[in-house]
């Protein structure tokens, strides 16, 4: 009963989050205009990973997509496959634990598959959740970092009294949806895992039984046979995600510079 | 066709409040920012602020902020702005004007209403 | 607030004539998310209501004539009319459209010569 629980809630946890995961990629809302330095703004900017857009205070909203692939900054670019990835593994993931769910009965389908589905869409949950994670990290991080290069230089000619403020980006609300809803499909995929264990079969300890023949002292000791689960050693060690953390020496200016290449 | 017809001439002491109406007619009225604009005579032109009927969301020019209230009435498709604690510097024509929707400018005016403070 | 200043104040010139103003910002118009100018450009005669010509700097509101053009970026812009008619004499105000208060220009004068 706990298993089928733990399976359930496991699945419901990661639906939430690949549906957030989705939500986040779609959203325009990557990187909003910080008003802090200019909160009378008539004009307000937001960009998403598809595109860039500008909200007039009459209304008026105008979306332009980045029509390009190989003029957008190569960390945009790798944030896009991240969450692409994440998606994709995430989908898959949901695919395999809706027929590995114990409460769907398919055919004469064991529990050893059930279990060895389980444990699948559970790892495919936590690495579409890492991606998701580190997806949305990168661009926080790159936002960071462009955030204090445009303040280095705000006012960009002060002669003549004239001022340029240069726009700068802050976290929008898409980057808040994907950490948390990274976060739920990875705590989702552990508990996929968790629920595997609970649904392998038991082993089977046969006690050993000495059988004293007539004639001679010779006990038989049936060896304890072992369910093969198809999910023992051979998956203990295995290495399931390398973050392998990256420095990025050169910082990229994103967006404004390559929005209409 | 588009039109805003706003209320008659006033007469005002100072320290009394009027209160303007601007009756909007041939489009969407909630769909629209109304700003109000004045110009007192011979001079340029000073921005008021602007209301969005449909969300009552308003933005004030901080040098009105404290006298001028702007209120609409959707049954009536009706902006209204009210100045308080009168002057005679705010002896002017006052404009309301539809927020264009492709852009932050105003495209439709009223006609205009003369607010004359004399004592 | 933004400060628009506009030069010549006023401006004398004859029908035919290719005029020009311009007006100056306190601070860029330039909106780098979508690389606009939020600039804005009225016509007014005397008892009338102010008439928008030019949004986004340099774009023609629908059905204002052709010889009516708005150019220029940042912080200097430019309101021509290539050829004058008798029509065009009245005053001619910029707009701050970027941030709030909303401000407007002096204005410059066009009167027949």
């Known amino acids: 009963m706990a298993v089928t629980a733990c399976q359930g809630l496991g699945f419901v946890v990661s639906l939430i989050g690949i549906a957030g995961i989705i939500a986040a990629t779609c959203m325009d809302q990557w990187s909003t205009q910080d008003l802090y330095n200019n909160p009378v703004t008539a004009v307000f900017n937001y960009q998403g990973l598809w595109r860039s857009c500008v909200r007039e205070s009459s209304g008026f909203t105008e979306c332009r997509g980045y029509f390009t692939l190989l003029g957008l900054p190569a960390m945009l670019q790798a944030v896009r496959a991240l969450m692409i990835v994440g998606i994709v593994l995430g989908a898959i993931g949901l695919l395999v634990s809706i027929f590995a769910l114990k409460c769907i009965r398919i055919g004469s389908m064991e529990d050893s598959a059930k279990a060895n589905m389980t444990l699948t869409s559970g790892i495919m949950f936590i690495v579409s959740g890492l991606c998701a994670i580190a997806g949305v990290s990168v661009f926080a991080n790159m936002l960071v970092t462009n955030f204090w290069m445009s303040t280095a230089n705000m006012y960009t000619g002060m002669g003549g009294m004239v001022q340029t403020v240069q726009t700068r980006y802050t976290f929008g609300a898409a980057l808040f949806v994907g950490w948390v809803a990274g976060g739920l499909t990875l705590i989702g995929g552990v508990m996929m895992c968790i629920a595997c264990r609970g649904l392998a079969p038991e082993e089977t300890n046969y006690k050993a039984v000495s059988y004293h023949a007539s004639g001679h002292s010779v006990a038989y000791k049936p060896g304890g046979f072992k369910a093969s689960t198809g999910f023992g050693s051979n998956t203990k060690n295995k290495k399931i995600y390398d973050g392998g953390a990256r420095t990025e020496d050169e910082v990229q200016s994103y967006p404004s510079k390559h929005d209409y290449v | 066709q588009v039109q805003l017809v706003q209320s008659g001439a006033e007469v005002k002491k100072p320290g009394a409040s009027v209160k303007l109406s601007c009756k909007a007619s041939?489009?969407?009225?909630?769909?629209?920012?109304m700003h109000w604009v004045r110009q007192a005579p011979g001079q340029g032109l000073e921005w008021i602020g602007m209301i969005h009927p449909n969300s009552g969301s308003t933005n004030y020019n901080e040098k009105f902020k404290s006298r001028a209230t702007l209120t609409v009435d959707t049954s009536t498709s009706t902006a209204y702005m009210e100045l308080s604690s009168l002057r005679s510097e705010d002896t002017a024509v006052y404009y309301c004007?539809?927020?264009?929707?492709?852009?932050?400018?105003?495209?439709?005016w009223g006609q205009g209403t003369t607010v004359t403070v004399s004592s | 607030d933004i400060q628009m200043t506009q030069s010549p104040s006023s401006l004398s010139a004859s029908v035919g004539d290719r005029v020009t103003m311009t007006c100056k910002s306190s601070?860029?118009?330039?909106?780098?998310?979508?690389?606009?100018?939020?600039l804005t450009w009225y016509q007014q005669k005397p008892g009338k209501a102010p008439k928008l010509l030019i949004y986004w700097a340099s774009t023609r509101e629908s059905g204002v004539p052709s010889r009516f053009s708005g150019s220029g970026s940042g912080t200097d812009f430019t309101l021509t009319i290539s050829s004058l008619q008798p029509e065009d004499f009245a005053t001619y105000y910029c707009q701050n459209d970027y941030s709030y208060p909303f401000t407007f220009g002096g204005g410059t004068k066009l009167e027949i010569k």
């Open positions: 004007a539809r927020r264009y929707y492709g852009s932050i400018s105003p495209d439709y």
């Open positions: 601070q860029s118009l330039l909106n780098s998310g979508n690389q606009k100018n939020y």
């Open positions: 041939g489009y969407t009225f909630t769909s629209y920012w």
